[in-house]
Interface confidence: medium
């Protein structure tokens, strides 16, 4: 079965649907499941063999205004002796999320949905090695 | 996008808070980025804490398909390619925002929803105490 994209009128339009101007959609930004319970292990960013730091980015014209980004601390991975092993690579793991962007045009304001790529952490991988023929 | 007149007294009186309900343009900015992690990188196979990707599909949500990670092993893969149980593979979880059709089945009416996804796995040193 074809999965509808945002804005596609694949669904039968029920009578209860609110009227929406053409080319736009109604978005309630009161978040469902605001208090999710993350059961992630403690301090994994420091204890990982591919450790990372967090940076908070702030933009008052974005909702949510605060987005946390991770950055890998090393190019290599940390070995059992606590030293960096450059025969392995620390690489970022990324995930897309949606944000609402507020744009000012003179004395008017418009809202735009935007996909943002968030780096959530890092993992240690074996490098891809290309051998010369 | 759809423009909404600003409060009287523009440009000085600016509401710093977002309104509860907004009209947004149907075109999503950066919409065509690659959403299939299997195609975007092979880290899930090359990692010392490899993971499998599971397709989570929901037509009442945008994006309708989200890929979820599940660590393959309890331990991590060592240099010999074996699972080392002295290290732990743990999931990296992230809260993301998606759109939920509200009321259900409506084509152009949504509400933001926060969902928890497991994005990948990382290898960590376990926390253990040794008896003196």
């Amino acid at each position: 079965r074809k999965i509808p994209k945002v804005g596609h009128t694949f669904f039968q339009k029920p009578e209860s649907c609110p009227p929406v101007p053409g080319g736009s959609m109604k978005l309630d930004i009161g978040i469902i499941n605001e208090n999710q319970r993350v059961s992630m292990s403690r301090n994994i960013e420091s204890r990982s063999t591919s450790p990372w730091n967090y940076t908070v980015t702030w933009d008052p014209n974005r909702y949510p205004s605060e987005v946390v980004q991770a950055q890998c601390r090393n190019l290599g991975c940390i070995n059992a002796q606590g030293k960096e092993d450059i025969s392995m690579n620390s690489v970022p793991i990324q995930q897309e999320t949606l944000v609402v962007r507020r744009k000012h045009q003179g004395c008017s304001v418009s809202f735009q949905l935007e996909k943002v790529l968030v780096t959530v952490g890092c993992t240690c991988v074996t490098p891809v090695i290309h051998h010369v023929q | 996008g759809i423009t909404i007149p600003r409060n009287p007294g523009c440009p000085n009186s600016e509401d710093k808070n977002f309104p509860r309900t907004v009209m947004v343009n149907l075109n999503i900015h950066n919409r065509n980025t690659n959403t299939n992690p299997k195609r975007s990188s092979d880290y899930y196979n090359r990692s010392t804490s490899p993971w499998n990707l599971h397709r989570n599909e929901d037509p009442e949500r945008y994006p309708s398909v989200i890929w979820e990670a599940k660590c393959r092993h309890l331990g991590c893969i060592n240099a010999d390619g074996n699972v080392d149980y002295h290290m732990n593979s743990v999931p990296i979880q992230q809260e993301i925002l998606v759109l939920r059709r509200e009321p259900p089945h409506c084509p152009n009416s949504f509400r933001l929803e926060k969902i928890l996804v497991s994005v990948g796995c990382t290898c960590v040193t376990p926390i253990v105490h040794h008896v003196a």
Partner: antibody, heavy 124, light 111 residues
Amino acid sequence: EVQLLESGGGVVQPGRSLRLSCAASGFIFSNYGMHWVRQAPGKGLEWVAVISYDGSNKYYADSVKGRFTISRDNSKNTLYLEMNSLRPEDTAVYYCAKVGASGDYYYSYGLDVWGQGTTVTVSS
Amino acid sequence: QSVLTQPPSASGTPGQTVSISCSGRQSNIGRHYVDWYQQVPGAAPKLLMYYDSIRPSGVPDRFSGSQSGTSASLAISGLQSEDEADYYCATWDDSLGGYVFGSGTKVTVLG
């Protein structure tokens, strides 16, 4: 031998309190997450609470949240469950159980060691 | 009402294979690994399987586990009289922020 021994059960009136203890032996208690699980007469298993190895993280079932408190004393190798505002539906055998792997895990290796249980009866 | 659904009962004659299903959702089985427990009447539960399909030492290889999507299953091959017990699946649930048990399945060995 790895052992868990629960105590503190008994008959109590609704609204009253009770404190269960679980004495651990045969393993490094401070390395392991610990759970409380209960079983009402003739019913299935119901998870109650979990505490991380160091006591920093605690999770509770919705049915006991705000009334029960899980805690541990690693120096005494003992797990506790403080039960307040008890209700008749809290009547059950209460088991403490150990997580199968040390460190972070709350569940991934299953609950590999269980006590024999202590009975709590809430009745007027 | 458990968030992990199991059939209330299953039965078989000695030597047969019995399968028990455990149905959940994305926030539990879809994201976390499943454990299985065996409980004989009057005794504490015993860990039978963890991480979907790993048997702890001492558990016979007649027991096997598998998982697909948001469901898991436990199979008991070469059924024996001592397998008569209640079986529970369990896993973590991110939405509830806790460990959850299935409703339980009573396995009966006939004849």
